[in-house]
């Protein structure tokens, strides 16, 4: 290389990361195998769970404002879960990104898109509940499924906007041991006259902005909304929280627990630019907390089911019946189910966002299992515990 051929400029912390070499330690190899297995399982679970939630909530349930929020949360989690197999592959090939720069940018962007979308949607859910209790008349007149979808659309647009810097500054960097990193390179675009200053300011700006916009502000909105609702309900003499409140509380708690550590380490990483002593801690901790953040997308569908009353009891009692009904051949069912269709309301308040989804009263085959999870297969689609929790607009 000629003396004047400037190498790809990297921030000090990134260059030091590129110098870290892989160990051939046996115990570390076992940890790697376990990580691949765990992430592989999480990928599969996340895709299946969120796919089921999307299908059930979008196609098998009466559309309400609440189901609209859940639908969009599940969509965000499905996106994240869909990117998890590629992260698993990255781990499997020895922590090396072999899928190219463009896919590195896209993959990382999905992670951040999910981060922002989750935070924004949980804020919207909390504000929605707050409005229902604090401004019931206004909510009665303006709380429509169409309005909820419009709000979600705006929130998705904001999430995309906030993800742009992460797409722009994501890059593939070759490590000195031959592996490839898919990581921030804040000097990638217009590094400015002073690289050290650019590294410090941009890394800090990214860490602080994502902490505020995707974590602190949403949690502040959620806490404020919860406080406002609690105060109002205390005046009305209501004690027991409704089903939907329990569901939201569980999802918010999971969000805080899964994303909190990630933001802590992200802020530490920004500090590590000026304080190299923090770097080893960041390098060791970030992979774990990033995985924990990913797992939030896998945990949410489980929470939707577990926070609904009677679910486990119903599971134990009806498992045999369910298996029997699933294993019934299509020909034994007769054609009755396909000829009867549940009448859907034409109002904006209950219109399905997925026009292609028809709603048979008695789904067939595997769909019968999903139907049971949300209520009795033979009964009205609104009678299942998850359905009741999601359809509850006043609790």
């Amino acid at each position: 290389m000629s003396a004047n051929a400037t190498l790809k400029p990297l921030c000090p912390i990134l260059e030091q990361m590129s110098r870290l070499q892989s160990h051939s330690n046996t115990s570390i190899r076992y940890i790697d195998h376990a990580a691949v297995l765990l992430h592989g399982l999480a990928s599969l679970l996340g895709l299946v769970e969120n796919g089921v939630i999307l299908f059930v909530v979008g196609c098998r349930m009466r559309q309400t404002v609440v189901t609209t929020w859940v639908l969009h949360l599940a969509l965000s989690d499905l996106l994240a879960s869909a990117s998890l197999p590629f992260f698993t592959y990255f781990l499997a090939v020895g922590h090396s990104w072999e899928l190219g720069t463009t896919f590195c940018k896209l993959h990382s962007s999905i992670f951040f898109l999910n981060m922002f979308a989750s935070g924004f949607l949980l804020s919207a859910i909390s504000l929605d509940r707050c409005l229902q209790v604090v401004r019931p008349v206004w909510a009665q007149n303006h709380r429509t499924v169409a309005a909820a979808h419009k709000v979600c659309l705006v929130l998705w647009a904001l999430a995309v906007l906030n993800t742009v810097p992460y797409f722009v500054f994501r890059d593939t960097i070759s490590r000195l041991d031959g592996r490839i990193m898919c990581y921030y390179n804040v000097l990638l675009l217009n590094p400015g006259p002073d690289r050290d200053a650019t590294c410090n300011s941009r890394q800090a700006a990214l860490a602080v902005s994502k902490f505020l916009l995707a974590f602190l502000v949403p949690l502040a909105i959620i806490a404020s909304s919860h406080a406002a609702v609690s105060l109002r309900l205390q005046h009305r003499g209501r004690r027991r929280p409704g089903r939907f409140v329990r569901l939201v509380a569980a999802v918010v708690a999971a969000f805080a627990l899964c994303w909190g550590p990630y933001h802590v380490f992200s802020l530490l990483e920004a500090r590590a630019h000026a304080n190299p002593g923090l770097r080893p801690l960041v390098w060791r901790g970030l992979p774990f907390v990033t995985s924990l953040a990913f797992f939030n997308s896998v945990a949410n569908p489980v929470l939707y089911v577990l926070t609904c009353p009677d679910m486990l009891r119903k599971l134990r009692r009806s498992l045999r019946t369910v298996l029997e009904s699933v294993l019934v051949d299509d020909s034994e069912l007769g054609g009755a189910g396909s000829s009867r269709r549940r009448r859907t309301s034409s109002t904006a308040r209950s219109a399905s966002p997925l026009a292609l989804c028809s709603r048979p009263e008695e789904p067939r085959g595997p769909a019968r299992l999903l139907g049971w999870l949300l209520g009795s297969c033979a009964a009205s689609p609104q009678t299942g515990p998850l359905n009741r929790a999601l359809s509850s607009t006043s609790s």
């Epitope: 990297l10 870290l20 400015g192 002073d194 690289r195 200053a197 190299p276 002593g277």
Partner: antibody, heavy 118, light 107 residues
């Protein structure tokens, strides 16, 4: 060809001041971080100052902090080291060195001798 | 401050010998280590950076290895032009300190 030429060395009394210069050529000076390294006669090497490519970040070891100031003029392709309150132990050959990336001195000047003596 | 301890401080060897110089840091420096060669009256020259990477124009008989706190510079077959003083330097946390040097002399 990369060239770093130091100047400004000489004999100075204890407590005195001196300003060293390093003229750079053969590369885009403003793209590289720079450092000063010294070597006392018959002794080892000691890093004494660092400056980022744009000049916003500087760093020094405790032995010279508060006495030495590193600066640069990218328009003149020149690096400077202002040395105040000089002591006998500051006697050394002072080298300016270019950082390969953020670290690793890939090019060095030939050095300039600073003698602090009464 | 991180202390860098080089050993041996001097060694005598013949042309064609395999020479190994070690450098020990007082704490983990995560491969942020460089090796320099200095001949009398001359400026130091970068030989190895990032503990294992050969600098441009350096013959392949030189190699760097190590991790954590222990690093090694090896010259597989010593040549007449290799007789010089070798210094290690860490670039982990400032101040970036050098080892005291290893003088490789002709036996």
């Amino acid at each position: 060809e990369v060239q770093l030429v130091e100047s400004g060395g000489g004999l100075v009394q204890p407590g005195g001041s001196l300003r060293l210069s390093c003229a750079a050529s053969g590369f885009t000076f403003s793209s590289y971080s720079m450092s000063w390294v010294r070597q006392a006669p018959g002794k080892g090497l000691e890093w004494v100052a660092y400056i980022s490519n744009g000049g916003s970040t500087t760093d020094y070891p405790g032995t010279v902090e508060g006495r030495f100031t590193i600066s640069r003029d990218n328009s003149k392709n020149t690096l400077y080291l202002q040395m105040n309150s000089l002591r006998a132990e500051d006697t050394a050959v002072y080298y300016c060195a270019r950082h390969r990336t953020n670290w690793d001195f890939d090019y060095w000047g030939q050095g300039t001798l600073v003698t602090v003596s009464s | 401050d991180i202390q860098m301890t080089q050993s041996p401080s001097s060694l005598s060897a013949s042309v064609g010998d395999r020479v190994t110089i070690t450098c020990r840091a007082s704490e983990n420096i995560y491969w942020n280590l460089a090796w320099y060669q200095q001949k009398p009256g001359k400026a130091p020259k970068l030989v190895v950076y990032a503990a294992t990477q050969l600098a441009d124009g350096v013959p392949s008989r030189f190699s760097g290895s190590g991790s954590g706190t222990d690093y090694t510079l090896t010259i597989s077959s010593l040549q007449p032009e290799d007789f010089a003083t070798y210094y290690c330097q860490h670039f982990w946390i400032t101040p970036w300190t050098f080892g005291q040097g290893t003088k490789v002399e002709i036996k």
